[in-house]
Structure formats: C-alpha cells, structure tokens
Interface confidence: low
C-alpha cells in the first residue's frame, strides 16, 4: 500500500471547494433540546447567500428546522438530528463553518436557550424540592472529546422555588475555578462549560434546596484527549474483483477521520504506453473527489456496464491535515465464457459481480461534477 507518495494526475479534475482553515466544532445536545448553530461571516464582512447542509444534503426549512443566513435552529432534537452540519456559501460551496452534532440522552452538552425547564408555580402550597425531569438525569457519566461544550442539568421544582448551587469534587464550584469560566443558568437549572479540557474531569454535583429540604445529583465528566491522526481506511471486501463484461461493479472503503478528509477515487492509467511519469511517479486519473464532513464515511465507487479497459488498479485515497492513507483495489474484466470458468471458485470468494445491468441517470449522480472528460469515462458513473 503506497502512502503519501505524490502521483501525477491525468485528466480534467474539477477543483473541490475546501473548508476554511479551523477546527470542526464538536457539540453534544440532549434529546429534546433545541440545537442552535451560529456561523458569523468571516472577518465580519458581508456573508452573501448561504446554505445549511447536514451530512452532505441541503436542509429544508420547516416548523422544526429554522434556517437563517448565519444561524440554524433545530427544535426538539432527536438522535436522527445527529450528524455533520455545515454552513456554505451558496455559489462556491465553500464551507464557512462546520459542526459535528451528537444528540444523546440527558445530561446534554451544548447550550440551548429553550427555557423548557424554567421554574414554574406548581400550585403546591409548600413542599421540598423534587426533580421535574428525572428521566433526563439517568446518564450519570458523560465522556466527551476535549473542546466540546458540556451542560449538566438538574431540572427541579418546589415551593418556595428552590435555589441551585454546584460543587466540583465535593467543593463549591465557581467560574474563576476554570479557564473560560462557567455559565450558570438558574432558570434552566444548568451548568455550562465551554471548550472542556482534561483538567475539567471530575464529579459535578448540583445541590437544590429550599427551607423544606435538599436534593442532590452527581454527574461524572470524563474529557477524552484526541490524538491527531491521518485518515484510517478499512477496505470493503472483496478488495480484488473479477467481473463479467457489461456487468456493474462496486468498490467501497470506509474512511475514519476526525479532521475533514479529502477523499478521492483514482485509477492507475497508462500514458503513451507508460504507467509512470519521467520522475517515476504513477499516472493516475481522478474519478471522484470531494471533502467529507463526517467522522466516518462509507465511500463507494460504482462502475456500470464495465468493459475490458475498466480493468486495472483503483485507489481509495483520503487526506487530512495530518497525512494520507490509501487502499488499492484490482478489477479484472472477462468475457462471459472466461468468467463462467472462474465462477465457482470466484463465487465462493464473493468476488463476482455479474448482476443485472443498471442504467444510472444523472439524477442518481446527485448532480456531482464529472471530474474527468466524458470521453475517458463515457460509461462510468459514481455514487
């Protein structure tokens, strides 16, 4: 497997819009929270038309999804709302901001302003404090990557309205005890810490009390340090495939990367009968190229109606700011008779893809730009 070696690119590769330099913001929200993402214009300048995208698909505004040029709100979030969100310039598709959003059971991280747990008059004459949302306090251990925003909540009620205070490792916890401070939202019964670091690990206790009694809840926070690493590729099996002329073939490989990886499908080609350039670097042509916004991407290359010239070596390559990882895939294309002779042996290995021919429309392509000339790839379509 060749890693990080330069390769000569042949064919007309369209330029892929790259993300702005900067970290992907990691946010964790509780189920039922309002997810609120804000993307101010870079340098305070004019923003221009923008589009909000989740996992590569444009978001359609609705009663629950409120879309503005610099702000996105998703109300009453559920697990399905987890994913990679980005705000892009509509014309260039340049990524202005990107967020990784995870929606979990309470306690949540993130800092919504939904106010749903504000103190209310319960109509009870007098009474000791009690938890109003105990089902959202089940998760006692919260493990989040460094740089996340964390919020602990202890929604409660009582008459008179109880007060809430916070302890860290059994001692009074105040803003000056951590760099970056803390936000205490008494009406939401919450403690918010932005951009957590390993020194924030510990036990956090909310103490809710009025003159009739006191209740407390302890949460444990673990902050996970991230180790920088280049993308990790897990090849889909089989890596080498034998296909019948005219059939469809699909390669896929899984890409894992904390930082946004630039993913490419490449094919080794010959130029003037040579596989390598004068300096010894292989000639490759770019079949597909894009920037992934998910931590884990299952990337596929689909070749429809293969011919003999589709045979050869294909590469799945992922690059992030740390490094490059590649996986090689081989495709052999045979006429029907040659393939039948190999069928029994190959079928056991699961490597014959001789399914029905499928016509793939431009619509199926998701409007992606073709990255090399139509002539070179007149029957190649990629998903």
């Amino acid at each position: 497997e060749s890693l990080g070696t330069e390769q000569r690119v042949v064919g007309r590769a369209a330029e892929v819009p790259g993300p702005e330099p900067g970290q992907q913001e990691q946010l964790v929200f509780g189920s039922g929270d309002a997810v609120e993402l804000s993307c101010p214009p870079p340098g305070g300048g004019p923003m221009g038309p923008t589009v909000w995208v989740k996992d590569g698909t444009g978001l359609v505004p609705s009663e629950r999804v409120l879309v503005g040029p610099q702000r996105l709100q998703v109300l009453n979030a559920s697990h399905e709302d987890s994913g990679a969100y980005s705000c892009r310039q509509r014309l260039t598709q340049r990524v202005l901001c990107h967020f990784s959003v995870r929606v979990t059971d309470a306690p949540s991280s993130g800092d919504d302003e939904d106010g749903e747990d504000e103190a209310e008059d319960t109509g009870v004459d007098t009474g000791a404090p009690y938890w109003t949302r105990p089902e959202r306090m089940d998760k006692k251990l919260l493990a989040v990557p460094a740089a996340n925003t964390v919020r602990f909540r202890c929604p409660a009620a009582g008459n008179p309205t109880p007060s809430i205070s916070w302890l860290k490792n059994g001692r009074e916890f105040r803003g000056e005890h951590r760099i970056g401070g803390i936000k205490l939202r008494h009406q939401q019964w919450s403690l918010v810490m932005e951009s957590v670091v390993p020194s924030d690990r510990g036990n956090y206790t909310c103490v809710v009390e009025n003159k009739f009694g006191s209740i407390r809840q302890t949460y444990t926070l673990d902050v996970l340090e991230r180790s920088p690493h280049r993308p990790i590729l897990q090849a889909g099996l089989p890596a080498n495939q034998t296909a019948v002329l005219g059939s469809d073939v699909e390669f896929h490989c899984k890409v894992y990367s904390d930082a946004q990886p630039h993913i490419q499908w490449l094919k080794h080609v010959e130029v003037n009968g040579s596989k390598v350039g004068p300096d010894g670097t292989p000639y490759v042509t770019v079949l597909k190229s894009w920037i992934s916004e998910s931590v884990e991407a299952d990337v596929r290359l689909r070749l429809a109606n293969v011919s003999e010239r589709d045979g050869g070596e294909y590469l799945c390559r992922a690059t992030n700011f740390i490094g490059v990882a590649e996986k090689a895939f081989w495709l052999s294309v045979h006429g029907p008779r040659a393939a039948e002779e190999e069928l029994v042996e190959a079928d056991e290995a699961g490597s014959v893809y001789a399914g029905e021919q499928k016509l793939i429309s431009e619509e199926d392509l998701g409007g992606e730009q073709k990255l090399i000339s139509e002539e070179d790839l007149h029957h190649h379509h990629h998903h």
């Epitope: 497997e1 990080g4 920088p228 280049r230 990790i232 700011f321 740390i322 490094g323």
Partner: antibody, heavy 122, light 108 residues
Framework: QVQLVQSGVEVKKPGASVKVSCKAS????????ISWVRQAPGQGLEWMGW????????KYAQKLQGRVTMTTDTSTSTAYMELRSLRSDDTAVYFC???????????????WGQGTLVTVSS | DIQMTQSPSSLSASVGDRVTITCRAS??????LNWYQQKPGKAPKLLIY???SLQSGVPSRFSGSGSGTDFTLTISSLQPEDFATYYC??????????FGQGTRLEIK
C-alpha cells in the same frame, strides 16, 4: 493516563539477539500502531519500523530489513522489538512510541516509552 | 527517501530570547511536519504536529509555521526548561519516517 513502559537495560555480545518490550496502558491498544525509534550515543533519532496492533502489519526501515522483527501481544497490551545479529553500531537507546493509527505509519508520535539502553560489546 | 535538514545544528541563547529553528525537506511534504523536544536522558516529546498545531499541554510560547519544503519552530520567549535538543520529522512519505539531525539549544 497514557503510558508506555519499556524493559530494562540489555548488554549483548556481537552476533546475539535482543528483544525489547513496551507495555502500553491508558488507551485502547489495538486502535494504534507502535513505532520503534533508536538513538545511538550522542546521535539523532532513527526510525526503525512500525507495527499495526490492529492487524499485525509491519513496515521496517530498509537498512534493518531481515534483522528486525516487531510483534505485539494484545492480551497484555505489549509490543516487542527483536533485533538479531547484533553489531557494535547497534548500541543505542531504543524507544517505542505510540503511532496514532492502525493502518499506516507516519503520524506524530504523541507518547513515548522511557527508552531501553542496549549495549553491544565483546 | 525524504531528507530533512535542520539549521542551525546548535544555538546559544538567553532566557527571554526569541528563538527560531528551521527545517528543510528535500521535496514537498505539504504540512506533514512534526517537531519534538528532547532533554538529555529522556524520551522526545511532541510539541507541534501538522506544521503548526500545538500538541495539548505544550506552552503557547512554542509555535510552528511553514508548508511545502520550509518550516520553522519559534520559541517566543525562552524559559530555562526550554534548553534541549529539537528535532523535526516528516510524516508525509512513509516508510521511512525521517527526522532532522537535531538542533541543540544551549544557554548563552
């Protein structure tokens, strides 16, 4: 916290073999690689090779090919580096380092063992 | 193999000084460059990865810059504990991973 603890000092005769161990703790051993780096007295750092804990794949520096073998034992979270046919110029401090990937080497080495001095002398 | 050349090979400076160490690669390595600090009898310690990203726990007086073939490690205000040997390392084309020959930073 992440720690890599190496075995102790070794004194060997030319032609012998040495096997250095590196016990990892504080992280998921199989999701990382281990690289081995050596440093001769008063000299710079020389990369020897890498092993994927996940799948056992190895990559060795060309000059050591055939003399070095890297292995791991996931049950004890330990990596091993064996160097055979020792020569006097193999005298060095040998370091293991966590390599942040289990598919390919080349990441920054974010955690290192304390080093094992191997002296080759007749 | 990609060769990494550091300069200077040794350097004398005083506490409070601003110090710059450079590293040149024999071919373009994009931003795949790491910097390490090593003190006598100790293992190297990662300071900067990906040319300019500060490893967690490393003081902000350390910074890195550059891309392609030319890279710089800067210590904005030398502290007594910064006197050590510094190595650059490329992680672009592997194997092999290659290190610079080191820059020894001494007290003037």
């Amino acid at each position: 916290q992440v720690q890599l603890v190496q075995s102790g000092v070794e004194v060997k005769k030319p032609g012998a073999s040495v096997k250095v161990s590196c016990k990892a703790s504080g992280y998921t051993f199989k999701f990382y690689g281990i690289s081995w780096v050596r440093q001769a007295p008063g000299q710079g750092l020389e990369w020897m090779g890498w092993i994927s804990v996940y799948n056992g794949k190895t990559k060795y520096a060309q000059k050591l090919q055939g003399r070095v073998t890297m292995t791991t034992d996931t049950s004890t979270s330990t990596a091993y580096m064996e160097l055979r046919s020792l020569r006097s110029d193999d005298t060095a401090v040998y370091f293991c380092a966590r390599d942040g990937d289990y598919e390919s080497s080349g990441y920054p080495f974010d955690y290192w063992g304390q080093g094992t001095l191997v002296t080759v002398s007749s | 193999d990609i060769q990494m050349t550091q300069s200077p090979s040794s350097l004398s400076a005083s506490v409070g000084d601003r110090v710059t160490i450079t590293c040149r690669a024999s071919q373009s390595i994009s931003s795949y460059l790491n910097w390490y600090q090593q003190k006598p009898g100790k293992a190297p310690k990662l300071l900067i990865y990906a040319a300019s990203s500060l490893q967690s726990g490393v003081p902000s007086r350390f910074s890195g810059s550059g891309s392609g073939t030319d890279f710089t490690l800067t210590i904005s205000s030398l502290q007594p504990e910064d006197f050590a040997t510094y190595y650059c390392q490329q992680s672009y084309s592997t194997p092999p991973i290659t290190f610079g020959q080191g820059t020894r930073l001494e007290i003037k």
